[in-house]
């Protein structure tokens, strides 16, 4: 059991086992190691806090091994609290876990999560909760987590994770949908921006189309193209030194998350992760989830913008890809809330109808 206390009062309690599926580079290519949270793991007291009014939110940092850190940063509103950000620090110079690693540096990866619960209830997830980060997938097993405690023990009530909930036995009848579905028209282009304390960290203009392959209740496999309708979509996000996120909530049933990373040595930003949670009423399993945190798309130098008039296909998983139309994006460094110098995609540069953007 991991506890964070302030003046003897517990404000965060957590109990879980965790594994960290980590990809790292060697001279002979990529290697994968699965690190388990050991029984000796403990709360890092000076890295954990109950939060300070108007200054910081509660956080739990767990330390283990040779400098490994797992941090859960919490936030809340009137009715719910969540793990807003999870970060993992690992040490590539640890030859026991990372033999022949090309780099010997200490790496930090982070991601937003969908760990959330009602205030005054514990978050409970027996099934694995996966959080995808750049080169690392964290899986929490048999998790019980609660923040914003007032009486130093887990609440009686609980909010169960989606994976633990039984599938509804009767789903509303879905309209019959031919296989394959008719191709919808191109999605509308919308502008998105994300700002933090230091100003704008993401500008994007794009049309988004989801390409989903799934099994229907009648055992047939169908591929559907779904356009994200900007008029029915709300955008939010976060700015971080190493991670910029754009979170789109569409029509009450779809959450599409874009994570942009930065390569500090080459000063380039790129789309590193996409997560999708949506409901497909006619699917055998209506809750459709897909994620990939190891993408390398929409790349440009920090301070510049990436632009592509041609349709781009970003493959997330076997069953899910995103078709991005007329994309213009800039992450991390956005001067004066305007797009910087344009770096065009190869598809545009090779095009007969090449347009110059000034």
């Amino acid at each position: 059991l991991f506890e964070v206390k302030n003046n003897g009062t517990t404000c965060i309690m957590a109990s879980f086992s965790a594994s960290f599926l980590t990809t790292y580079e060697t001279a002979n290519g990529s290697q994968i190691v699965n690190i388990s949270l050991p029984a000796s793991a403990e709360v890092l007291k000076n890295g954990s806090s109950c939060g300070k009014e108007n200054v910081s939110d509660p956080s739990l940092t767990i330390t283990f091994g040779r400098g490994y850190l797992l941090t859960l940063n919490f936030t809340r509103n009137a009715t719910r609290y969540s793990v807003q950000l999870m970060s993992f620090v690992y040490n590539l110079s640890d030859t026991h876990l990372f033999p022949n690693a090309s780099s010997k540096e200490i790496k930090t990866v982070e991601s937003i999560t969908d760990i959330r619960a009602d205030i005054d209830k514990k978050y409970r997830c027996v099934s694995g909760t996966q959080v995808h980060m750049n080169n690392v997938t964290v899986t929490l097993h048999d998790a019980t987590i609660q923040a914003y405690l007032s009486n130093s023990s887990f609440s009686r009530g609980e909010t169960r994770c989606e994976q633990d909930r039984p599938s509804p036995t009767t789903a509303p009848p879905a309209p019959p949908s031919p296989s394959p579905s008719p191709v919808p028209k191109s999605p509308s282009v919308d502008k998105y921006n994300v700002s933090g304390t230091n100003g704008t960290c993401l500008l994007a203009s794009m049309g988004l189309q989801l390409n989903l392959t799934y099994e229907r209740k009648d055992n047939t496999t169908v591929t559907r193209l779904l356009n994200i309708n900007p008029n029915k979509t709300s955008a939010s996000g976060s700015c971080g030194a190493h991670l910029v996120t754009l979170e789109l909530h569409s029509e009450g049933t779809t959450v599409l998350l874009f994570q942009f990373g930065m390569n500090a040595s080459s000063s380039r930003f790129f789309l590193q992760g996409i997560q999708l949670n949506t409901i497909l009423p006619d699917a055998r399993d209506p809750a459709f989830k897909a994620a990939n945190g190891s993408l390398r798309a929409l790349q440009a130098t920090v301070g510049n913008s990436y632009k592509c008039n041609a349709e781009e296909h970003v493959r997330v998983t076997k069953a899910f890809s995103v078709n991005i139309f007329k994309v213009w994006v800039q992450a991390f460094k956005v001067e004066g809330g305007q797009f910087g110098s344009v770096e065009e995609c190869l598809l545009d540069e090779n095009s007969m109808h090449h347009h110059h953007h000034h």
Partner: antibody, heavy 118, light 106 residues
Framework: QVQLQQSGAELVKPGASVKMSCKAS????????IHWVKKSPGQGLEWIGA????????PYSQKFKDKATLTADKSSSTTYMQLSRLTSEDSAVYYC???????????WGQGTLVSVSA | DIQMTQSPPSLSASLGGKVTITCKAS??????MAWYQDKPGKGPRLLIH???TLQPGIPSRFSGSGSGRDYSFSISNLEPEDIATYYC????????FGGGTKLEIK
């Protein structure tokens, strides 16, 4: 000990607005939601909404979402409720309440009487 | 919003007798149920929370039970000071009061 001190009674004209206050003391203001409850002879007790003073997030009852506006001032540990477009139906006693952990509405203010009359 | 249906709206009972009030939620509220006593000119008084847990200082004549969507509240050995209006309140998902039950003594 926990105390919630509400502002005094209000006599207002139909169509006008009224803003009442609830000053909290005896606990960390941003750690708990403050709820507002209406008590009237015709409708009994009705939950209006709540505010989390930490970030101003305020869920409302469907019935009151166009009637009430909740705000909080962290510097003075005070929560406010504004009622707009008042009618005689809004004549009631309004309470601010702090919920306790896993306990519904444990600490109540003394109430603010609002009378709407031409 | 969750709806709470409280019944009966009013009831009359004899001193020393027993009364029971019921509340039905429009969905499962996981025992997040409280009961209040309200008297004219006074603030509401919390009697029971978490379906059956008596608040400190509340006599054991008051009791509550239930689960899922159905809950009940009882007062046994009725006394004159029990004349009041009683309300149920769900606090599982946002908050909703029942319509109230006015208790009178015969």
């Amino acid at each position: 000990q926990v105390q919630l001190q509400q502002s005094g009674a209000e006599l207002v004209k139909p169509g006008a607005s009224v803003k009442m206050s609830c000053k909290a003391s005896g606990y960390i203001f941003t750690n708990y939601n403050i709820h507002w409850v209406k008590k009237s002879p015709g409708q009994g007790l009705e939950w209006i909404g709540a505010i989390y003073p930490g970030n101003g997030d305020a869920p409302y009852s469907q019935k009151f979402k166009d009637k009430a506006t909740l705000t909080a001032d962290k510097s003075s540990s005070t929560t406010y409720m504004q009622l707009s477009r008042l009618t005689s139906e809004d004549s009631a006693v309004y309470y601010c309440v702090r919920a306790n952990w896993d306990v519904a509405f444990a600490y109540w203010g003394q109430g603010t009487l609002v009378s709407v009359s031409a | 919003d969750i709806q709470m249906t409280q019944s009966p709206p009013s009831l009359s009972a004899s001193l020393g007798g027993k009364v029971t009030i019921t509340c039905k939620a429009s969905q499962d509220i996981d025992r997040y149920m409280a009961w209040y006593q309200d008297k004219p000119g006074k603030g509401p008084r919390l009697l029971i929370h978490d379906t059956s847990t008596l608040q400190p200082g509340i006599p054991s004549r008051f009791s509550g039970s239930g689960s899922g969507r159905d809950y009940s509240f009882s007062i046994s050995n009725l006394e004159p000071e029990d004349i009041a209006t009683y309300y149920c309140l769900q606090y599982d998902n946002l908050w909703t009061f029942g319509g109230g039950t006015k208790l009178e003594i015969k």
